[in-house]
Interface confidence: low
């Protein structure tokens, strides 16, 4: 009974009463400095305590800066809509001293025909309509403005773009008499960028387009288009980068083939093939040219679209991604895993690792999980001793002021971090494993035994006794 993880999460606060925005203080710095952790790597706790103390002492000067809430802005151009015709929008928290902008694309699967879109509208309306969106959202993980939670980009301008187009951010069709639903994901991103230019984005130095799950795939599909849009609008100096979390999927053979009946059981290639037609989906131009007409679905798969991208993209992907397993018809239901399934799961990790070998900026822990960057404890997971915020910081440094990653990695500052151990949760910093359906916590040894891994087999390549391995895993988890 293994698989779904729960991350510790801050309790949700009620939205604060409306208040007037403070005007930017005269003489405020135009850019925040990047935090370079090289010198403090050994004593992070002490450093963080100092940062926190500094932040608290500065609080009276800039109370609005430490308010965690992002505020909802529905698009002024109301013709750019969610599935049901309600206006799309974004949540924004400005950081007037910073020239960094983080635009985050939310995830949440997709629908690809009238029937499963109707069903989605009945059960997950928030992902198809803006009518019930809350006035504010709390920024968590990479969207947090607290240095302890977000040592990477805590001082950036934060934008959360809710997913309400059900099209993996690729659609370009409006609602009409013929079309029951609008699919305008690609247009929503363009319109948000256009509106943000009037809210300070025009002065940006770096725009990081990030996203998780379907939002991560959305990054791969839209990052070059955003760069092109800004160039055309006269902002060629804004460096556009991508951060794709849990959106790097494989079009591999399903564990058990099922007919394309609904979103979850439909093979991803078939779902996307149908979806593109239904959404009037658009893919990056350079990728589209590599495939014949009708074969654009290939561009939704990271390892095929990535080599065609011009913007630098950092790929974050669990080697044993739960959404990937779901579309592959692997359901860890509480019954012990059979040998064939265990080998399938291991092979998935191997294939995923292989697709990342030529991706210079990547972070791929050998965990069974899904999504990471807006989890409050996104800093906890490490690959080869490096956390994700640290790897992103190294990536920033490696990019310098250019648009392309430099080929030589910085000494002591790695950006290609892919686990090489071969089984789920062989990385002791993986998030807690929980029963897939009850959420009940398991220790790693229990989980691995349930997955059918013989402790002797797992221990041998490490030169350990099974008992030592169990002790090690239990302590590390």
């Amino acid at each position: 009974s293994e698989g779904r993880k729960t991350w510790r999460r801050r309790g949700q606060q009620p939205p604060p009463p409306p208040r007037t925005e403070a005007a930017p203080a005269a003489g405020q710095p135009v850019e925040s400095f990047p935090l370079d952790f090289t010198a403090v790597e050994g004593n992070m706790d002490s450093f963080m305590a100092q940062v926190k103390s500094l932040a608290q002492s500065l609080y009276p000067c800039s109370a609005q800066q430490l308010n965690e809430d992002l505020r909802l802005h529905l698009l002024l151009n109301t013709s750019v809509t969610c599935n049901d015709g309600s206006p799309a929008g974004y949540y924004l928290k400005e950081s007037r001293g910073s020239r960094r902008w983080l635009l985050f694309l939310e995830g949440g699967w997709y629908c690809f025909n009238r029937e499963n879109c109707d069903s989605r509208y009945d059960t997950m309306r928030r992902l198809m309509s803006s009518r019930d969106w809350p006035r504010t959202r709390t920024g968590t993980g990479i969207l947090s403005s607290q240095p302890e939670e977000n040592p990477y980009w805590w001082n950036a301008n934060m934008v959360f773009i809710p997913y309400c187009s059900s099209d993996v951010w690729s659609g370009a069709s409006s609602k009409s008499e013929k079309n029951e639903y609008a699919f305008m994901g690609a247009l929503i991103i363009q319109e948000v960028v256009r509106e943000l230019l009037g809210r300070g984005l025009s002065g940006a130095k770096v725009l990081l387009l990030a996203g998780s799950s379907a939002g991560g795939t959305g990054v791969l599909l839209n990052v070059d288009r955003v760069a092109e849009q800004l160039e055309k609008l006269g902002y060629p100096a804004i460096q556009v980068r991508g951060l794709a979390d849990s959106g790097w999927f494989l079009d591999n053979k399903q564990y058990r083939h099922t007919d394309c009946v609904d979103t979850i059981t439909c093979a991803p290639t078939e779902a996307i093939r149908r979806g593109i037609r239904y959404w009037n989906g658009v893919v990056p131009e350079r990728c589209r040219r590599q495939f014949q007409e009708g074969e654009e679905w290939n561009c939704f798969f990271g390892y095929k679209v990535y080599p065609t991208l011009r913007c630098p993209v950092f790929v974050v992907q669990w080697l044993f991604d739960e959404a990937q397993l779901t579309v592959d018809n692997v359901h860890l239901t509480g019954q012990p895993v059979q040998e064939g399934l265990r080998l399938y799961i291991q092979n998935l990790g191997r294939e995923l690792r292989h697709t990342l070998k030529d991706v210079p900026a990547s972070f791929a822990p050998a965990c069974l999980s899904h999504e990471i960057i807006i989890r409050s404890h996104w800093t906890d997971v490490q690959v080869k001793g490096t956390s994700l915020p640290r790897a992103l910081h190294c990536w920033d440094r490696s990019l310098h002021d250019s648009h392309k990653a430099s080929k030589t990695p910085l000494k002591g500052c790695p950006v290609h971090l892919v686990d090489s151990c071969p089984w789920p949760h062989c990385n002791p910093s993986c998030p807690t494993v929980r029963d897939q359906f009850t959420g009940q916590e398991m220790n790693v040894a229990q989980f691995l035994m349930h997955m059918g891994f013989d402790m002797q087999t797992v221990a041998q390549p490490q030169g350990l006794e099974p008992s030592e391995l169990l002790g090690m895993l239990s302590n590390g988890s």
Epitope: G108, D435, F437, Q440, H450
Partner: antibody
Framework: EVQLVESGGGLVQPGGSLRLSCAAS????????MHWVRQAPGKGLEWVSY????????YYADSVKGRFTISRDNAKNSLYLQMNSLRDEDTAVYYC????????????WGQGTLVTVSS | DIVMTQSPDSLAVSLGERATINCRAS??????????MHWYQQKPGQPPKLLIY???NLESGVPDRFSGSGSGTDFTLTISSLQAEDVAVYYC?????????FGQGTKLEIK
């Protein structure tokens, strides 16, 4: 017919012990995780303990941890709850319930057995 | 622990009218497209009976006047047209993590 029947309840003094049993029939018992849930007189439902299908995983509510032990015998289609160091606040109807294998909800409940802790 | 709060504590509705019971979780109980929230009905002297599982799925044998909705932290049980046999206490329960806590219950009566 899918059925769960609890037994073993009764009157016991504070500090005493009782062992509850739950007999399952009409389904493959060894395929399902099982829970104990209790309900104090006139009060709401409180989850007590869980055991996975093969007994590999067990969990307890904080209120009973260290005093209660859940176990099962799949050969006998039976679930047990050994209750030691009983307290007044353990007085309740105890239900055994089957965990649906695909969602963590309780799809089959027994009729319950009353445990009264009183001096 | 996730705290489940039901509202109202008690409810009186006329026969044939709609009854709505709300349940709020202290943290999100939805993940990967599923909401781990369930509803039970308990009549006096009887064990609870499963009505709705995973937020909106009707358990087999339960009349279709019962329905469930919601995601994230806020969920609703609706009885579209109250019948005399629906008089009972209703509980919500999450199974997102351990312990799988219940709401305090809502007593439904006929007005």
């Amino acid at each position: 017919e899918v059925q769960l029947v609890e037994s073993g309840g009764g009157l016991v003094q504070p500090g005493g012990s009782l062992r509850l049993s739950c007999a399952a029939s009409g389904f493959t018992f060894s395929d399902y995780g099982m829970h104990w849930v209790r309900q104090a007189p006139g009060k709401g439902l409180e989850w007590v303990s869980y055991i996975s299908s093969g007994s590999r995983t067990v969990y307890y509510a904080d209120s009973v941890k260290g005093r209660f032990t859940i176990s099962r015998d799949n050969a006998k289609n039976s679930l047990y709850l050994q209750m030691n160091s009983l307290r007044d606040e353990d007085t309740a109807v105890y239900y055994c319930a089957r965990k649906h294998y695909n969602g963590g909800y309780f799809d089959v409940w027994g009729q319950g057995t009353l445990v009264t802790v009183s001096s | 622990d996730i705290v489940m709060t039901q509202s109202p504590d008690s409810l009186a509705v006329s026969l044939g009218e709609r009854a709505t019971i709300n349940c709020r979780a202290s943290k999100i109980v939805s993940t990967s497209g599923y909401s781990y929230m369930h509803w039970y009905q308990q009549k006096p002297g009887q064990p609870p009976k499963l009505l709705i599982y995973l937020a909106s799925n009707l358990e087999s044998g339960v009349p279709d006047r019962f329905s469930g909705s919601g995601s994230g932290t806020d969920f609703t049980l609706t009885i579209s047209s109250l019948q005399a046999e629906d008089v009972a206490v209703y509980y919500c329960q999450h199974s997102r993590e351990l312990p799988p806590t219940f709401g305090q219950g809502t007593k439904l009566e006929i007005k």
